[in-house]
C-alpha cells in the first residue's frame, strides 16, 4: 500500500508516521497542529484555530 508519509504532510520539519489509525505528525519544537502548520507563540499560546469537535491537535486525519 502507498506510504501516506511519502508526500511529507507534516510541515516545518515535523515527523510523519504511518500509524494503523491514520497518518500522525510529531511536530518539531515550536509548532503544533495536526500537520504542524501552526507556530506556538512565545507566551505559550498558538495560532491554532478552534479544532473541529472531537479533533485534538495530533489526532490522525484519515
Amino acid at each position: 500500500r502507498a506510504d501516506p508519509c511519502a508526500a511529507r504532510p507534516c510541515a516545518h520539519g515535523g515527523r510523519c508516521y504511518a500509524h494503523f489509525s491514520g497518518l500522525v505528525c510529531a511536530c518539531a519544537p515550536g509548532y503544533m497542529g495536526a500537520r504542524c502548520e501552526f507556530p506556538v507563540h512565545p507566551d505559550g499560546a498558538s495560532a491554532l484555530p478552534a479544532a473541529p469537535p472531537g479533533l485534538r491537535p495530533g489526532d490522525p486525519q484519515r
Epitope: D3, C5, R15, Y17, A18, H19, V24, G58
Partner: antibody, heavy 118, light 109 residues
Framework: QEQLVESGGGLVQPEGSLTLTCTAS?????????MCWVRQAPGKGPEWIAC???????TDYASWAKGRFTVSKASSTTVTLQMTSLAVADTATYFC???????????WGPGTLVTVSS | QVLTQTPSPVSAAVGGTVTISCQST????????LSWYQQKPGQPPKVLIY???NLEIGVPSRFKGSGSGTQFTLTISGAQCDDAATYYC??????????FGGGTEVVVK
Amino acid sequence: QEQLVESGGGLVQPEGSLTLTCTASGFSFSSSYDMCWVRQAPGKGPEWIACIYTGDGSTDYASWAKGRFTVSKASSTTVTLQMTSLAVADTATYFCARNSGYGYFGLWGPGTLVTVSS
Amino acid sequence: QVLTQTPSPVSAAVGGTVTISCQSTESVYGSDWLSWYQQKPGQPPKVLIYQASNLEIGVPSRFKGSGSGTQFTLTISGAQCDDAATYYCQGYYSGYIYAFGGGTEVVVK
C-alpha cells in the same frame, strides 16, 4: 508477520566497544518509523537510549547516551547501535523497538544481553 | 523528563481492581502521548494502552487508561492471575524524547 531481532550482544571488558544490530522482517524502513534502542539492566526498568527516524535519518539520544552511543541505519532492514567506553553499569538486555506513531513502542525484539565485566 | 509511578508492589484479589498512577514532571507531547506496558520476566514489554486511553489491538478490555498532561492512570478491572506482572508507563515529549517510569509490580492473589 512483522518482527525485530537483535544480535551482537555478549561479554565485553570495561572500556571496550560493541556494535549491536537490529534486523527487521515483515517490513522495511521505506516507511517512516522511529527505530529505537531501549535497555534494561537486571531487575530494573526500561531505559530509552536512542532512535533513528527512518524518514530522513535524523537521530535523537537520551542526554546520558550522547557521545558514547551511535545509532545508524545500515540498510533498509537493519539498524545498528555502536557503544564505546563501556562500563559495568552498561550491563543490560538491549532491545530494539519501533514507534509507528503516538510515541509508543508497538513492536519489540526479544533483546540481546550485553555483559560488561573484567 | 521524569515519570514517577505508584510504589511497588500493588496487591489485588482475583476479580478486584488495580489502579496504578504515573506522574510526569512535564506535559507529554499533545497532552496524551503516554503509553502503558506490561512486562513479565524474560520478555520484552508489551504495549497495553497508547495515547493515554487507546487500547492496543488484542488487549483485553479490562485494561483502561486515563489522564492527560502530567497525570495518568492505568486501571485493571476484574484482575486475573495472568495480570501479575510489572507495569510501566512511558511518555513521549516535545523534541522527540522518550522516557519510562520506574515500574509498578502487581501481585494478584
